[in-house]
Amino acid sequence: QDSRGCARWCPQDSSCVNATACRCNPGFSSFSEIITTPMETCDDINECATLSKVSCGKFSDCWNTEGSYDCVCSPGYEPVSGAKTFKNESENTCQDVDECQQNPRLCKSYGTCVNTLGSYTCQCLPGFKLKPEDPKLCTDVNECTSGQNPCHSSTHCLNNVGSYQCRCRPGWQPIPGSPNGPNNTVCEDVDECSSGQHQCDSSTVCFNTVGSYSCRCRPGWKPRHGIPNNQKDTVCEDMTFSTWTPPPGVHSQTLSRFFDKVQDLGRDYKPGLANNTIQSILQALDELLEAPGDLETLPRLQQHCVASHLLDGLEDVLRGLSKNLSNGLLNFSYPAGTELSLEVQKQVDRSVTLRQNQAVMQLDWNQAQKSGDPGPSVVGLVSIPGMGKLLAEAPLVLEPEKQMLLHETHQGLLQDGSPILLSDVISAFLSNNDTQNLSSPVTFTFSHRSVIPRQKVLCVFWEHGQNGCGHWATTGCSTIGTRDTSTICRCTHLSSFAVLMAHYDVQEEDPVLTVIT
């Protein structure tokens, strides 16, 4: 030690007083003012502490430093003097910074910057709110999920940026006078069916439902295989076709080919194609009967059954299809002689006459329609000369009383048995399928081959028999008059008809003719 010099052991942040004592530098303090042992330390004084005499003044913050302190303007303020730091209130020139002016994009989108002392706030635009995790950021308010239920129950709420809309639900429309979007929107169900806004296939009927619609198969139609009924995409097929198949138990390639064509037509059928489909079916039937092929090798009974099946099915199919035709008269004829005459009308109170090459039919229109059936009235007549091949040797079954009269007054059946078909086979049908007991009779005038003298001419119809086959019968049909090549028949029911020449040896005078017929 140098008694006159400086102590060399002074602790950090202190200076020697003499050779035996030290004092802490300004901004530092020790336990005692004079340090006499090297074990003591000088600690930084926090001039910014609450009890400190330092005052930086308003809008400023005190920052403690090693051995000293600085006064700085608080965030959001800046010194007018430009000096970044100062030591006391008298040197303080801090004033508020207008952050909004400094940085116009401070509140990003959807907010307006509002300057405050030392800071700023963002005021959100209508439809926005401050994000809790970032109070300076405006975010869209979802009015639809906020529990405010701003929309009428007939609408659904559509949130969009900064706003929302009350839109009609799908299948609904604004009530008259209501807007579509604002919160005062009120909607009602759209009837897609009557307004034509539906997508139903033409094979279906549109049914309106609340907010939607469905498509159901037309009466007499069924859903296509694998497609459910009552959907928007339901497509149906006419059951008339699907059930007109070869009769089980009859095996014929020609017949199978015919029914394959029928089924194909059924698969592709749409009501708008009714006219074409009718023509295609009759064309196919005409071809089948012109060249029956292996049908002619079937036993006679089976041929009669096939004829019965064809006549039956044809009537059903034509009745079904003709309901989709527009009003008017149609006539089609085919190479092998098949002929169709059809009249479609909204019901009128008059008689109708359908004329063909070999037959004329007359009946009252009011027979045509079932009461309560909304569709058009249809009267149809088909001449099918080719059916005669299949009906060759078909039996004639007379009512017991007619049979008895004939046996009593005639020589009886000649040796060669079966009656001869003189005319074309014709089939008559109406939109009304209840034709077993007409309120006024139908009249047929047949042109036919010459009658062999002294033979009995009978007006007959094809009665579909017990076993699905059939026979000729006269019940309900009477012969009004006959000439050499024409016969007038009157019947109280509809079916397939023809004129037969029975092998009875008629006497010169026929006293019971009128009774029989």
Partner: antibody, heavy 120, light 107 residues
Amino acid sequence: EVQLVESGGGLVKPGGSLRLSCAASGFTFSSYDMSWVRQAPGKGLEWVSTISSGGNYNYYPDSVKGRFTISRDNAKNSLYLQMNSLRAEDTAVYYCARHYDYPDYAMDYWGQGTTVTVSS
Amino acid sequence: DIQMTQSPSSLSASVGDRVTITCKASQNVRTTVDWYQQKPGKAPKLLIYLASNRHTGVPSRFSGSGSGTDFTLTISSLQPEDFATYYCLQHRNYPLTFGGGTKVEIK
């Protein structure tokens, strides 16, 4: 005495195949149309297929069309049903039956049935 | 396809009762309807063909009637051996279709 005896049933996995046979005796087999009819457990009867007496015509409902094939061997008095792409819903007792002559066409004689189970 | 709707699906009756089962076709099938009887675990047996004709060996108490769309099987006096399930079948068109069956049980 007319007799029809089915065989060939058994357990098969979905998608698998099976061939059923029906041995006929006591009548002129080649003169009659024949059919297969099935009955699912606890359910009603369902027509499966028909073949003509000569074997050249066969008929199926949509439910089996393209998967099942009916055939016959008149020399062996036998009727067959080849079943492919089997499904769980094909599980049933399968009967073969003889048809009356058309137009009557009822099934006048039936076999005792063979059981087909389609299960994984 | 032609649907055959059979009713009732089941019935309880006593020996000696007259029992009537009906079958309704979804469209005209003329008379191409047959009736079959089936006992548990056994093959069906033909009773009536073409709506009203009794098959060989079928007792006269069984009768069938109807044509077009409505058909009836009648058992005039039920016997113990008649307790079974009865089915109708149409063979007017393909596919051949059976009714759902009527189970006749002992009361």
